[in-house]
């Protein structure tokens, strides 16, 4: 047994990473700003195995994945590239941002759309 | 900020309570036994507000709610009665056990059915 964290009060802690699900619907930029104001960033999937509980998260929430206009590739907020083994990206509508939608699937969306969002704080 | 727990390794910690989602499908009795073997019990909803993250959990998982044959009432594993403000119980098929199905809804099921399950360890 052991302690998890540290995390902001009432956040979820898993493998020393902190997560919070926010009900307010915001644009991607607003969601990013909200996470930053809480010393965190939008959700990043770095390992299906280590973040396995996320496969059961229902509905659609902004995550920290954006498309680079120059070459159309997708990258995380921290600048790292999206890897095929992190999640499946379903590109249907035109959009440069993405929502997380359970079972490690993400869906492209217009960044101006309003959605709930997930903030995350990686373990140091 | 603060630490959460203590919890078994790799469990989810929220408000000092510990949760784990198990992928193996078992009967209700087998699920209960699995949780007990890990010094925990099947999921109990005691407060929508304090367990708000559970509203986003998709799929259907055994929880610690059973029907008392004598009077048809529903109670938790710890013997306390189900309260209307804890969750909404949808009585679909005949069954004396219940699965948790997101948004604080539970669905009755035959206890011999196979389902995934959620174990929980209350904060001391």
């Amino acid at each position: 047994e052991g302690y998890c964290g540290p995390c902001p009060n009432n956040w979820i802690c898993h493998r020393n990473n902190c997560y919070q699900f926010f009900n307010e619907e915001k644009t991607w930029n607003q969601s990013q700003a909200s996470c930053l104001s809480q010393n965190s960033s939008l959700l990043k999937i770095y390992s299906k195995e280590e973040q396995d509980f996320l496969k059961l998260v229902k509905s659609y929430h902004w995550m920290g994945l954006v498309q680079i206009p120059a070459n159309g590739s997708w990258q995380w907020e921290d600048g790292s590239s999206l890897s095929y083994n992190q999640l499946t990206l379903v590109e249907i509508p035109k959009g440069s941002c993405a929502v997380y939608g359970s079972s490690f699937k993400a869906y492209t969306e217009d960044c101006a759309n309003l959605n709930t969002y997930i903030c995350m704080k990686r373990a140091v | 900020e603060g630490y959460c727990g203590p919890c078994p390794n790799n469990w989810i910690c929220h408000r000092n309570n510990c949760y784990q989602f198990f992928n193996e499908e078992k009967t209700w009795n087998q699920s209960q036994a699995s949780c007990l073997s890990q010094n925990s019990s099947l999921l109990k909803i005691y407060s929508k507000e304090e367990q708000d993250f559970l509203k986003l959990v998709k799929s259907y998982h055994w929880m610690g709610l059973v029907q008392i044959p004598a009077n048809g009432s529903w109670q938790w594993e710890d013997g306390s009665s189900l309260s209307y403000n804890q969750l909404t119980l949808v009585e679909i098929p005949k069954g004396s056990c219940a699965v948790y199905g997101s948004s604080f809804k539970a669905y009755t099921e035959d206890c011999a059915n196979l389902n995934t399950y959620i174990c929980m360890k209350r904060a001391v």
Epitope: I92, P93, G101, S103, Y107 | K58, S102
Partner: antibody
Framework: QVQLQQWGAGLLKPSETLSLTCAVY????????WSWIRQPPGKGLEWIGE???????NYNPSLKSRVTISVDTSKNQFSLKLSSVTAADTAVYYC???????????WGQGTLVTVSS | ELQMTQSPSSLSASVGDRVTITCRTS??????LNWYQQKPGQPPKLLIY???TRESGVPDRFSGSGSGTDFTLTISSLQPEDSATYYC?????????FGQGTKLEIK
């Protein structure tokens, strides 16, 4: 161009198990959920459930205790089994690609399943 | 489960008319609302997703609007081939649910 083709028994007796299969041709199989939806004669549409390539399933709680959806990734096929059928299960059953938030498209041609003694 | 209320259940209109069908949900679903057209003996066809985005190949006389709990499908100038039943569907929450349908007839 993704196309779905479905088949299975069209006439069942009460208490039997309905069994349908849907094959996916073209496009990505792994990137989506694959759904079953039914429509009783002259009535509306009811979502039954869905599965993805990894076997992850979501079911309608009203049918969950009788439904099994499975997948065969080697053939790009997914199947529906509905046990203990009654006359109330008489419907046209459709398979469809579930595009997450963006609706169901395309659809299979539909299979009329009649339950009668 | 999330309830979908569609109105009217049926309507009759003339070629060239502007037709509006509404869909109301029992709770907010953001813009995760899709519209389908179904003709007799055929599977439904996706017309609109994300409340207002036309599916590829759908004529621009079809448009969708709304967010939250109230949504509208509009056919700006009715054509004979638009005679069909129209369904709304929410993709916000499982189980996915459909409206009861609106049967549109051409006078």
């Amino acid at each position: 161009q993704v196309q779905l083709q479905q088949w299975g028994a069209g006439l069942l007796k009460p208490s039997e198990t309905l069994s349908l299969t849907c094959a996916v041709y073209g496009g990505s199989f792994s990137g989506y959920y694959w759904s079953w939806i039914r429509q009783p004669p002259g009535k509306g549409l009811e979502w039954i459930g869905e599965i993805d390539h990894s076997g992850s399933t979501n079911y309608n709680p009203s049918l969950k205790s009788r439904v099994t959806i499975s997948v065969d990734t080697s053939k790009n096929q997914f199947s529906l089994k509905l046990s203990s059928v009654t006359a109330a299960d008489t419907a046209v059953y459709y398979c469809a690609r579930a595009r997450g938030p963006w609706g169901f498209d395309p659809w299979g041609q539909g299979t009329l399943v009649t339950v009668s003694s | 489960e999330l309830q979908m209320t569609q109105s009217p259940s049926s309507l009759s209109a003339s070629v060239g008319d502007r037709v509006t069908i509404t869909c109301r949900t029992s709770q907010s679903i953001s813009s995760y609302l899709n519209w389908y057209q179904q003709k007799p003996g055929q599977p439904p066809k996706l017309l609109i997703y994300w409340a207002s985005t036309r599916e590829s190949g759908v004529p621009d006389r079809f448009s969708g609007s709304g967010s939250g709990t109230d949504f509208t499908l509009t056919i700006s100038s009715l054509q004979p081939e638009d005679s069909a039943t129209y369904y709304c569907q929410q993709s916000y929450d499982i189980p996915y649910t459909f409206g009861q349908g609106t049967k549109l007839e051409i006078k």
